[in-house]
Every structure is written in C-alpha cells, then in structure tokens.
Interface confidence: low
C-alpha cells in the first residue's frame, strides 16, 4: 500500500488532504506544523493521533491564538457544542438554550426561548395594571344588574421577536351595576358619564392597538 | 467484533416526528463518531448528520431546522429524532460507524430499518 | 450544491476490468478523500475503498480506486469481474457535508 500510494501520488505526502496547510507533515501523524493564521487540530482515530490545519476549529472546539502557534482547544463550557472562546458558547447541547454565551436548560426571568434557534431572547414587558374600570353595559353605566369592568396595562418593551407573544394587555371581568335604575327611570346615561365611557374606550383601543403597531413596525423594518 | 442495530417504528404518521435508536456493541460510542445516512426508494443514499466521540452533532443543512441526534452513553446508544415528517421521509434508514473528518468514511453499518410514512 | 455524479450503469463479462467514474461538480475531486461503497441486493452497503486508494481488510485486490484530475473525478475499478460483484455502486465525498454519488448498477453479461 506505502508503495502504490508513492507511486499514484508522486509529489510527496502533501497532495494528501490532511497535509493542506501544514509547513511539517507525515503521512502517519498528519500535521505537526501549520502555516501562518491556521489552526492546529490534534485529531483521535482510536488509538492514533493525527495533526491538521485548518482554517477554523471544529464543532466543540474554538480558535486559540499563541505567538508559537494557533490551536484549537475543547469548549469547556458546560452543555455548550460550539464556542467562540474558552468562556463564550455559541451553539449549546440539545436541550439547551443560549443566553450570554451560556447555555441554560431554561430562560432566565424576562426572556423568552426562542425554539427555532434555541436562544434566549428579550420577551415582552408590561407596565402595570391600571384601576379597574366603572362597570358598565352597552356603555351605560345603569339600567342593568350586571356589567363588565376593564383594566389595562402598557406594552413597556416589545418583544425581540414578533412570534414572541406578549401577555394580556386589557381583561375584563363581570361586575354588579351601582345603579340597577337609571335616575329619572330613563336608560342613558348623563353626559358626564358619557364624556368617562368615551374616554375609557379610547384607553383600551389604544392600549391594544400599540401591539399591532409593533408588529407592522418589525415587519416594515425586516 | 462492532455491530450497529437500528430500532423504532416502521409506520409514521405524516406531521408526526420519527425517533429511531441505534444500539452499539463491541464499541463505545464516547471513542468514535457516528452518523445517521438513509436510503430513498429510488435508491439514492443521503447523509444526515453525525455525531462526534465528544458529543458534538454536525447536520446536513438541509435537514437542520427538522434534526437532532442525541446519545445516551450508559447504554451505548445514539437516536435521530426528525421532526414533522412527510411521505418524503419514507426511506430505510442506516446508522454507521464514521471514521472522523476529514477521511470521510463509514467501516461499520447497521443492518437498516424500513420506515414508512404514511396516514 | 456540492454533486457527485455517476454513470447509471456499467457492464461487463466475466474475468473483464471495468472502471466507475465519480465526477465531482465544483471544486478538486483532491480536496477531500473519497470512500466507495458496495450494496448487493437491497443489503447495507459495504466499505470498499477508503482515503482515495485504501482498502480495508476482507476486500479483494480486485478493488482499486484512483484519481483523475483531468476528469475531477474518483475512479473505482474492478479487475477480474466475478458474478459476486453484481450491485450498486457509489462513492462518496465531501468535508462538513458528506455527499454520496448517484450509484452505478453494475451488471454481468
């Protein structure tokens, strides 16, 4: 075979692929040099080790640069695949998730997973609830025995992502009238409370509308 | 003497994820790398992805977003999970023995499981 | 996309020497070894040649694979045809993707 592999292959061991790069390299060991800017790579085949260079370090392993050579050393981040540096993980274990350069097997408080990438990423903020609303029916603030009443809350911070979704931001619950008569024995309300009513509507329609405004905003942007 | 056996369902579902696991004897899966390749009907061979002695997984781009390859070292087995599957998916799947990068070969295969998809 | 592409089919008679050629698409067929692969009747594939010109224990010396860089290609030939060598054949290739050829049947006249 050592013969027939001279023969076929004339110029040497270095038109063998594992010596692309080196400055030093057998056919047995591979790489043990490698040229300016590559990285030297130590390889395991069972019990054999073989040198390459290469032009950037394998999946669990990052680029270290010396003033001898550049190696390429193991990510020791833990649940981390692939790394940047020895402390920086950019692509973590199944199961995990990225956040910081670190790999979590759930987000941290205030961020969301995102699945397809498996990151961690920025969720969505919202203020606090305001007061709960007048209960009113059909707008009218009497006339009835039960009513609904609504609060609201602001978007603080939209998501990173606009398939990240973000809680409730207007609920309402059901509620007893103040007035189960209207004053007067008529049903509408007195322009007062008609001046609150509108007012309240426009709060709530704006609060839900910022959401959809958001997402038109990333969408324009993307 | 190495042996590779693949195990899982022959009948999947369309939409559903197909999990298939190979047991490896006479090895131990933390000393090599190993890889997931199928076999359409038509004959064509495909590789998927594989998985190094350490752990890491390295997948075919097309196959990214629907793969993963996992390994439970205690009893010496590795697994291919594909998401959402289609009919597409229907082929026999082998697991191998790969010989590390950047020789490029499989010494070790399994016998193949026949997977079907369909409703 | 990185192809490897075979012929579909090659004969020949018994005791012949025929040749597979597997022509890479972009890039020096030199760039990245070459394995080739046997499969008979619907059975695993069986490793024939590895790192170009390899063969690994239990192949015969019938077996013998090459490059040609005038063609890109990876070559596998077969001396001494025996009906035992009737199949498919394909070879294979690449770096972080690996890429395996179309096949070849080969058939016995």
């Known amino acids: 075979q050592g013969n027939r592999w001279r023969r076929s292959k004339r110029a040497s061991y270095v038109s063998n692929p594992i010596c692309k790069g080196c400055l030093s390299c057998s056919k047995d060991n591979g790489c043990s040099r490698c040229q300016q800017k590559l990285f030297f790579f130590l390889r395991r085949e069972g019990m054999r080790q073989y040198g390459e260079c290469l032009h950037s370090c394998p999946s669990g392993y990052y680029g270290h640069r010396a003033p001898d050579m550049n190696r390429c050393a193991r990510c020791r981040i833990e649940n981390c695949d692939s790394c940047f540096s020895k402390d920086f993980c950019t692509k973590c274990k199944v199961g995990f998730y990225l956040h910081r350069g670190r790999c979590f097997d759930e987000c941290p408080d205030g961020f969301a997973p995102l699945e397809e990438t498996m990151e961690c990423v920025e969720g969505c903020e919202v203020g606090h609830w305001s007061e709960w609303g007048t209960c009113s029916r059909n707008n009218r603030t009497c006339g009835f025995k039960w009513g609904l009443e609504t609060r609201t809350r602001q978007i603080v911070k939209k998501p990173a992502k606009d398939t990240i979704p973000c809680p409730t931001i207007a609920e309402s619950r059901r509620c007893k009238m103040a007035m189960r008569h209207c004053p007067g024995g008529k049903r509408t309300p007195k322009a007062k409370e008609k001046r609150n009513k509108k007012k309240k509507r426009k709060l709530i329609e704006r609060a839900q509308e910022q959401h959809s405004v958001f997402l038109a905003t990333d969408r324009a942007n993307q | 003497q190495i042996q590779l056996q693949e195990s899982g369902p022959g009948l999947v579902k369309p939409s559903q994820s197909l999990s298939l696991t190979c047991s490896v004897t006479?090895?131990?899966?933390?000393?090599?790398?190993w890889s997931w390749i199928r076999q359409f009907p038509g004959k064509k061979l495909e590789w998927m992805g594989y998985?190094?002695?350490?752990?890491?997984?390295y997948y075919n781009p097309s196959l990214e977003n629907r793969i993963s390859i996992t390994r439970d070292t205690s009893k010496n087995q590795f697994f291919l999970h594909l998401k959402s599957v289609t009919t597409e998916d229907t082929a026999t799947y082998y697991c191998?023995?790969?010989?590390?990068?950047?020789?490029?070969?499989?010494?070790?295969w399994g016998q193949g499981i026949q997977v079907t998809v369909s409703s | 996309e990185l192809v490897f592409t075979q012929p579909q089919s090659v004969s020949g008679s018994l005791g012949q020497e025929i040749s597979i050629s597997c022509t890479r698409s972009?890039?020096?067929?030199?760039?990245?070894?070459v394995s080739w692969y046997q499969q008979q009747s619907s059975n695993k594939p069986r490793l024939l040649i590895y790192?170009?010109?390899?063969?690994p224990s239990g192949v015969p010396d019938r077996f013998s694979g090459s490059t040609d860089s005038s063609s890109n290609s990876g070559i596998l030939t077969i001396s001494r045809l025996q009906p035992e060598d009737e199949g498919d054949y394909y070879c294979?290739?690449?770096?972080?993707?690996?890429?395996f050829g179309s096949g070849t049947q080969l058939t016995l006249l």
């Open positions: 191998a023995r790969e010989r590390p990068h950047p020789y490029a070969y499989f010494d070790v």
């Open positions: 006479g090895n131990s899966i933390t000393s090599s790398d």
């Open positions: 998985m190094n002695y350490g752990g890491g997984t």
């Open positions: 972009s890039g020096n067929i030199g760039s990245n070894y």
């Open positions: 790192k170009f010109d390899q063969r």
């Open positions: 294979l290739s690449g770096y972080d993707k690996y890429v």
